[in-house]
Structure formats: C-alpha cells, structure tokens
C-alpha cells in the first residue's frame, strides 16, 4: 500500500490524463511533462482539480511527469517516469503522412529492425483536442504486416493531429511510435486548374485557378511558379521558373510580341510558408509553329 505522503500519480495515455490523489486544503497545483529534448509542457490546472490533460505531447521517446501540490500543511512533489516499454528497435519507424487530392491521406511506416516476424502494427489518429479517435480504416500491407494506412475521410481531423502506431506480437513486447503532425506541413496541393493564355500583339496574359485544399486557406497563403518555355527547345536549355504570389485574381502578364513561336506554360502551387510544390499543371499552349517566327520572349 502507498504511504499517505504519496500523491499516487498515474497517467492514462489514451486520454493523456495525469491524475493524482486529491489533498485536503490544496492551495496550489502544477503538473509538468519533460521530454528528452528538454521541452517542458505544462497544462492549466485549478486547485480544485486533481488531474491535468496534456495535448501537445509525444511519448515514444520516454517522458517524465511531475506534479507539485501545496496544501496549507505541506508541499508534495512527485515524479512519474513513463518509458516506452517493449523491446528497443521494435517500434514502427520512418513514419510519414501526406494529404492529397483534398480529401485523402496516406500514412506509411517501416517495421522496426528488431521487430519479430509476427509483428502487427495499428494506427490510431486523434485530433489535437483529443476529442475524437480514428482507427485506420484501410491498411496497406507488406507480407501481411501493416506498413501503411489510407484514409478517404478526413472530417475528424483538425489543423494538428496526434498519430499513434501501436504494435503487437506473440513473442515480445513491441514499442509504440507517436507523432504530432500539422496538416499545413503534410498537405500536398493539387496543381492549379483552368490555366489559360490570351495574347494580343504585344503581351500575353496567363490566368489560373487556385487549387482547392483540405485546409481553409486564403489567396495570400499561395505561391505559384510559372514555367513558360518555347516548344521543341533543345534538350538542356532550362528556363528559370517565374515566382508569382497568390492574388484574388491569379494572373501573370508578360511581354511577347507577334509573331511568336509556339510556347507552353505550366504552373505549380505551394503554401508560402512551406514551399512543398505541387506537381505541374497541364501545359497551356500559345503561339504558332510557323518556322519564320522570331522569339521575342
């Protein structure tokens, strides 16, 4: 039995709740988590509560919880080590996810180098408020082992989400891997759509549509690159892309006088803060193929 002086601190990884035994006449309570990076996470706790809930934490590296409670009589300080139990090197590794085509997400991982042959991995996702848990609906397998997950419904996700890969085996304990990921960092944009080029005698105007995204973004959040090149150019002649900031009406006007040779323009998009470029759009062509035309781009 625990001595009366102990707070009996315990942690529930499912709810990220740290709880302790309530003390009479508590005047002050604080709880902390310290990770191996030297990062301290401290949730709000009121004196009437004997628990706190962590949101912004990853546990797979092993963490230390700490609770400080002052009462009118004495001070309590107690630590709880939360290791990643299981054999070292058995956890899923090289974990990554990406959102694509607005509504879909793929996550992939590799089996741990020390994982036994019968290892099986399971992915759980919680939104940042920990209010909803999604279990992977469709696993990608390699020789029967889950090494990826495909989601076709992202409605439960928020701007930052918690990913947990648990493992099971009949032979040994398997360590878990967890990660917090920003949707901003993992979304791959579709290329811009409706790329059109209209030319007059002296200029050409390129227009395009902002790609639809999973995140709610404004035009200010977009950066575009335009690749305007002459058709049938010699291999090895590379054009520098033209950078254009997102605007309410996405357009780029450039001088190009008649007669003009056959050209193609393609566009790609990225988040200005991330610069993970989308693939290039379909090329839109302008100009003509007639041999006597001079290039005035």
């Amino acid at each position: 039995e625990k001595p009366a002086s102990s707070l009996n601190v315990r942690f529930d990884a499912r709810t990220m709740n740290l709880t302790w035994d309530c003390q009479e006449n508590t005047t002050f309570s604080r709880c902390f988590l310290t990770d191996k990076k030297g990062r301290v996470v401290e949730p709000r706790v009121t004196n009437k509560e004997c628990s706190c809930t962590f949101r912004e934490i990853c546990l797979h590296g092993g963490v230390t919880f700490e609770v400080h409670v002052n009462t009118s009589q004495r001070t309590f300080q107690e630590k709880l080590l939360y290791p990643n139990s299981g054999r070292e090197g058995t956890a899923a590794q090289n974990f990554s996810c990406f959102i694509y085509n607005v509504d879909f997400m793929n996550c992939t991982w590799a089996r741990g180098p020390k994982a036994p042959r019968d290892v099986q991995y399971f992915l759980y996702i919680q939104n940042s408020k920990r209010r909803r848990e999604i279990q992977c609906p469709y696993y990608i397998e390699d020789s029967g082992t889950h090494v990826g997950c495909h989601l076709g419904n992202l409605s439960g996700l928020t701007s930052r989400n918690y990913f947990l890969v648990n493992g099971t085996s009949q032979e040994i304990g398997i360590q878990f891997f967890d990660s917090l990921l920003d949707t901003k960092k993992i979304e791959r944009f579709n290329p811009p759509g409706n790329v059109t080029v209209r030319c007059n005698t002296t200029h050409c105007l390129v227009r395009w549509k902002q790609p639809r995204t999973y995140q709610k973004l404004s035009y200010l959040d977009f950066q575009y690159q335009l690749d305007v090149h002459r058709k049938n150019m010699q291999p090895g002649t590379e054009n520098l892309p033209i950078n254009v900031s997102g605007d309410l009406e996405n357009r780029y006007n450039f001088p190009s006088s008649e007669p003009r040779a056959k050209h193609a323009v393609k566009i790609r998009a990225a988040d200005v803060r991330i610069l993970n470029w989308s693939s290039w759009s379909e090329a839109a062509e302008f100009g003509s193929d007639e041999r006597h035309h001079h290039h005035h781009h």
Partner: antibody
C-alpha cells in the same frame, strides 16, 4: 490589423519576480497562441516558449522550469509572462510574438511582435 | 537543438550595393526558415518565411533562397533604411532557434 502592446520597463532585485503583460488588439486572445522571445543587451534572440490561451497549455525550455509561468486573461485579451527567482543573466528585453498559423508548438514565422519590455535585474 | 550559424557577423556596405547574408543550420530544416530585420530600439520584423517568400509589405529588393541547411538573404540594392541586424530562425524543429545575427552597417 493585429497589435501587441507590452507593459513598461521593470527594475528588479535578484531573487524577485517580474510579470510582463502583452495586450492583444485586432484579434481575441483565444484565436492566438502567444510566444515569448527574449534578447539580452547586445545579444541575439532566444525563444523561451509558447502559451495557448484557449486551453491554458504552455511549452517552454527546461532551463526555465520552475521559474516561468505563462498565463492569459481572455476577458482583457492580455497574455502574461511571469519569471521568478530572477538573476542578473535574466536582464533582457522580453518580447511577446505571434503570427498567422502560429500555434502552441508550431510557428511559421512571427508576423507580429510587441514593442518589448526591458527587465533589469540588479542589486 | 538545431544550431543556426550566420555569416558574416558584420557586413559593411554602401547604399546601392548588393548584400548577401548567409545562414547555415546544423541539420536540415527543409524550407522552414524565416528572416527578420531588427533596427535599434525596435522589435524584429518578419521579412521572409518559407525560405523565399516575402512577408506582407516587404519590398522586392529583399529575396531569400536555399533549402536544407544553407540559406541566403539577398538585398539587391541597399537603401539607407536597410542598415540593421538580420536574424534567421528555423521553425522545422522544436525549439525554434535563431541565428546570432548579422549586422549590416554603412561603409
């Protein structure tokens, strides 16, 4: 347009505590995460930590554990940084900062800064 | 933690000249890098994010480039108001570390 306005300069004795405020206008405090960055005289910028006013969670560097408290008053849209057991090396300009898409544990660059509060620790 | 190293510590140039400031990360930070300008008695001002995207209201003489570990801030033609201290900051990995700064002074 968002603005962050900080409290005035403070002179403190070693061992004392200081509480710096950062009033937000143009947004409500709960829409933001407030980060604190300090700058010792003639030195570079040091990120201290971040605070999420919506759920009260704080993240900071271990070197500040036991000495730092970040809080917020949503009724006045004001964030606070309290630093206790002050020592001479805490003498610095303390800035609150935030930005578009800045959350508790993520920033994509701090677009908005307070004007800074000079805290001098001297016996 | 990721260490950000800026060079040179001081750069002496004249108005109208081109300035090239460097920032190196101790490990890859992808394109998660910001540049700030700080003038005496003022708070830092965000110039560049995403390594190369200009923040709102920043003149186009400021440009950023690089990814991974090596980054450059270029001021194509120095104006008198550009003389200040410049800091880079990585936001790929906690804690979000700053470089020690490059002081751009008038020659």
């Amino acid at each position: 347009q968002m603005q962050l306005v900080q409290s005035g300069a403070e002179v403190k004795k070693p061992g004392a505590s200081v509480k710096v405020s950062c009033k937000v206008s143009g947004y409500t405090l709960t829409e933001l995460s407030i980060h604190w960055v300090r700058q010792a005289p003639g030195k570079g910028l040091e990120w201290m930590g971040g605070f999420d006013p919506e759920d009260g969670e704080t993240i900071y560097a271990q070197k500040f554990q036991g000495r730092v408290t970040m809080t917020g008053d949503t009724s006045t849209d004001t964030a606070y940084l309290e630093l206790s057991s002050l020592r001479s090396e805490d003498t610095a300009l303390y800035y609150c900062a935030t930005g578009r898409y800045t959350s508790l544990a993520t920033t994509y660059g701090f677009d908005y800064w307070g004007q800074g509060t000079l805290v001098t620790v001297s016996s | 933690e990721i260490v950000m190293t800026q060079s040179p510590a001081t750069l002496s140039l004249s108005p109208g000249e081109r300035a090239t400031l460097s920032c190196r990360a101790s490990q890859s930070v992808s394109s998660y890098l910001a540049w700030y300008q700080q003038k005496p008695g003022q708070a830092p001002r965000l110039l560049i994010y995403g390594a190369s995207s200009r923040a709102t209201g920043i003149p186009d003489r400021f440009s950023g480039s690089g990814s991974g570990t090596d980054f450059t801030l270029t001021i194509s033609r120095l104006e008198p108001e550009d003389f200040a201290v410049y800091y880079c900051q990585q936001y790929d990995n906690w804690p979000y570390t700053f470089g020690q700064g490059t002081k751009l002074e008038i020659k």
